[in-house]
């Protein structure tokens, strides 16, 4: 053999009970002591420090703290140094050293020692991770190292958590003993924070000890707070709130169209939108995620705004008889009333739609002109003007005529046409054609689609010639012999030479 001792490095006992510290020791066989003596010291192995003597086999002299409370259960002759401490109190918590006394110079304090912990609560052991929906085993362990008093275990606050199974007395690695009771159950998220208790009582005594553990149940997030759909006026401030219940707290993320707008590990997350624009209208998603799962919900943000200036697409130039289709579109929220006017006359209207199609079958020159597309909702009104140009062959209007006065003849050729025609005056009797380009004879002015060309002939009063007016554009030509009106009808005055 050699010098050595074996005892638990730590041992526990309930206050007021007792504790048996199992201890064995060995020494070189050749020392062959006639009698083996021993001493238990408290808190220090150095006799020089005069540590309290817990037990001494040679004498009955022990420190006052251990008077009547210490007894050797082991037989030192059999190298068993097991110590019994009775009616333990907190001040007895600490280190216990054994010193073998074999006579002669052979006193040996073993460096191996036992740390006594005086407890007053059962130890409830909850697995490091308790997940909702997954069966868990919770144990209640209490020291059972007192041969005189044996603990009995019962659970507190375990209603609905299953029936306890008592494992009984178990030996730990270093020779200490524990009483163990097990509780098997499947926790729910509602069990998070639940206080589970265990009670150790000692029959025929008033000793009773309780311990509690708060359940830390891990569970995936559920979004519990979320705006319903939100309507906001352009330029206003919008707050979107997302709150989730989970353990541990989730990573909350606000997203739109796959873009992360804001995220934080929190139970709730506010997304603040300052001065919202229509571009921010859309669906916002809140994603809540932790290691145990995820949840997501969406909220629609509707940004209300006045219509944008309408845009007009379609044919703005048409040939008489064609069908014209014009599309007026805008953007607004809510959708607007769209109306197309021409000269204050409503041609077409649509309610709560963002576009209006105007169809004009077989356009005539009367359809030519300025049109207005007006978009209106409760937040405002915008309008866009557009011109429709109807192209057609010349039409010689009835007010075309010639009139003589003294020595001058004036002929008016009034033509309606689009595009503008070329006008020529033909005098068949003289085999002469006068074009509008001949400015000394012809004066032209245009008003809208009507062109008035005036031919002035001097010295023709006595015998006014026949005058034919011909108007021509890419759609055709029209000729008219201009009727003469009597002198009584037209009065010409020519002043000057």
């Amino acid at each position: 053999g050699h010098w050595g001792a074996w005892m638990p490095s730590s041992i526990s006992a309930f206050e007021g009970t007792c504790v048996s510290i199992p201890c064995r020791f060995d020494f070189p066989d050749e020392l062959r002591p006639a009698v083996v003596h021993g001493v238990w010291y408290f808190n220090s192995p150095y006799p020089k420090n005069y540590p309290p003597v817990v037990f001494k086999s040679r004498t009955q002299v022990v420190h006052e703290s251990f008077q009547g409370r210490s007894r050797l259960l082991g037989d030192l002759g059999l190298r068993n140094c097991t110590l019994l401490l009775s009616n333990v109190s907190p001040e007895l918590g600490g280190k216990y050293y054994f010193r073998g006394d074999l006579g002669g110079y052979n006193q040996y304090t073993f460096s191996e020692h036992s740390v006594l912990d005086i407890v007053n609560t059962p130890n409830i052991v909850v697995p490091p991770e308790v997940v909702a929906g997954t069966e868990v085993e919770v144990s209640c362990m209490v020291p059972d190292n007192c041969p005189e008093l044996r603990p009995e275990l019962s659970w507190l606050g375990h209603e609905g958590l299953g029936e306890p199974a008592v494992l009984g007395r178990l030996r730990e690695d270093e020779g200490t003993w524990v009483q163990v009771s097990l509780l098997h159950f499947v926790p729910t998220r509602e069990a998070n924070g639940h206080r589970l208790g265990c009670q150790a009582s000692f029959p025929n005594t008033t000793l009773q000890f309780e311990g509690y553990a708060s359940m830390d149940v891990k569970y995936p997030p559920v979004i519990v707070e979320m705006n319903s759909s939100v309507e906001a006026i352009e330029g206003s401030h919008v707050s979107l709130l997302c709150g989730a219940d989970s353990n541990p707290p989730p990573l909350l993320t606000w997203m739109r169209d796959g873009t992360v707008l804001r995220e934080a590990v929190a139970e709730s997350l506010l997304l603040e939108l300052e001065e919202v624009t229509p571009a921010e209208d859309g669906v916002y998603a809140c994603l809540a995620e932790n290691a145990y799962g995820q949840d997501n919900r969406t909220v629609g943000l509707s940004v209300m705004y006045a219509p944008w200036k309408p845009t007009v697409n379609g044919t703005m130039v048409a040939v008489e008889g064609e069908t014209v289709s014009i599309l007026c579109s805008t953007q607004s929220n809510p959708d607007p009333i769209l109306t197309i006017f021409k000269e204050k006359q409503i041609l077409s209207t649509v309610i709560y739609e963002s576009e209006l199609q105007l169809e004009l079958p077989a356009v005539s020159p009367e359809d030519d002109g300025e049109y207005w597309c007006v978009a209106e909702n409760q937040y405002g009104q915008r309008a866009t003007a557009f011109n429709l140009s109807v192209e057609f062959a010349p039409v010689l209007l009835l007010e075309s005529h010639c009139a003589a006065a003294r020595d001058t003849v004036q002929c008016l050729c009034v033509v309606k046409s689009n595009p503008e025609p070329s006008v020529a005056f033909e005098l068949p009797s003289r085999n002469v054609t006068v074009n509008e380009s001949e400015r000394e004879f012809v004066y032209s002015e245009r008003s809208g689609l009507v062109l008035t060309s005036i031919l002035t002939l001097r010295g023709q009063a006595q015998a006014p010639p026949r005058v034919i007016c011909t108007a021509r554009n890419l759609y055709g030509a029209k000729s008219l012999e201009l009727p003469f009106q009597g002198a009584h009808r037209l009065m010409w005055a020519k002043i000057g030479p």
Partner: antibody
Framework: QVQLVQSGSELKKPGASVKVSCKAS????????MNWVRQAPGQGLEWMGW????????TYADDFTGRFVFSLDTSVSTAYLQISSLKAEDTAVYYC???????????????????WGQGTLVTVSS | DIVMTQSPDSLAVSLGERATINCKSS????????????LAWYQQKPGQPPKLLIY???TRESGVPDRFSGSGSGTDFTLTIINLHTEDVAVYYC????????FGQGTKLEIK
């Protein structure tokens, strides 16, 4: 040089007490243990026990428990043997003898007694 | 306890001759930890305290003449004095200090 000087002879009546002193010099007192050895007239040597001068811890041989007390006064490098309730059979020469101690950690090893006092004769007689 | 038995109880040797004293222990005094024999020899002259001669069974204490030597191991040990001098007349004790300390009963050495 090392010296252990013991107190002088004592004549005591049975039932009385006696205290024998042993004053050490010439070495560091607490580095050596102090032993007590008895030699009855015409008899051999009997080891009574020893006292650890560093810790003050006494160890008694099995035949010398109870009436025999070892003590120290390290301030004057002196060890004491006190015998109470003296009996006639306690008549003997009492020797103190030092022994080297090798300390290591919380333990030590004791070696042979190398220096002895001159002895103190205690006579117990009515 | 370990019992030490010396032989002979007394011994007469002529001056200049060799004296041999034996000592037997009831149990081995060889310590396994350091392989040393925890045995010593003392010389005691009348009216004087014992004087250390040999320790560790064979190591001579300083100042002791080399006429004195010790031998043996385990349970059997011998003290040898060669070239015996007049001043060697004394009682010799063997002593074990392994376990609870014990002495032999002594051997008285005289001049023949």
């Amino acid at each position: 040089q090392v010296q252990l000087v013991q107190s002088g002879s004592e004549l005591k009546k049975p039932g009385a007490s006696v205290k024998v002193s042993c004053k050490a010099s010439g070495y560091t007192f607490t580095n050596y243990g102090m032993n007590w050895v008895r030699q009855a007239p015409g008899q051999g040597l009997e080891w009574m026990g020893w006292i650890n001068t560093y810790t003050g811890e006494p160890t008694y041989a099995d035949d010398f428990t109870g009436r025999f007390v070892f003590s120290l006064d390290t301030s004057v490098s002196t060890a004491y043997l006190q015998i109470s309730s003296l009996k006639a059979e306690d008549t003997a020469v009492y020797y103190c003898a030092r022994n080297p101690i090798n300390y290591y950690g919380i333990n030590y090893e004791g070696y042979v007694m190398d220096y002895w006092g001159q002895g103190t004769l205690v006579t117990v007689s009515s | 306890d370990i019992v030490m038995t010396q032989s002979p109880d007394s011994l007469a040797v002529s001056l200049g001759e060799r004296a041999t004293i034996n000592c037997k222990s009831s149990h081995s005094v060889l310590y396994s930890s350091n392989q040393k024999n925890y045995l010593a020899w003392y010389q005691q002259k009348p009216g004087q305290p014992p004087k250390l001669l040999i320790y560790w069974a064979s190591t001579r204490e300083s100042g002791v003449p080399d006429r004195f030597s010790g031998s043996g191991s385990g349970t059997d040990f011998t003290l040898t004095i060669i070239n015996l001098h007049t001043e060697d007349v004394a009682v010799y004790y063997c002593h074990q200090y392994l376990s609870s300390l014990t002495f032999g009963q002594g051997t008285k050495l005289e001049i023949k």
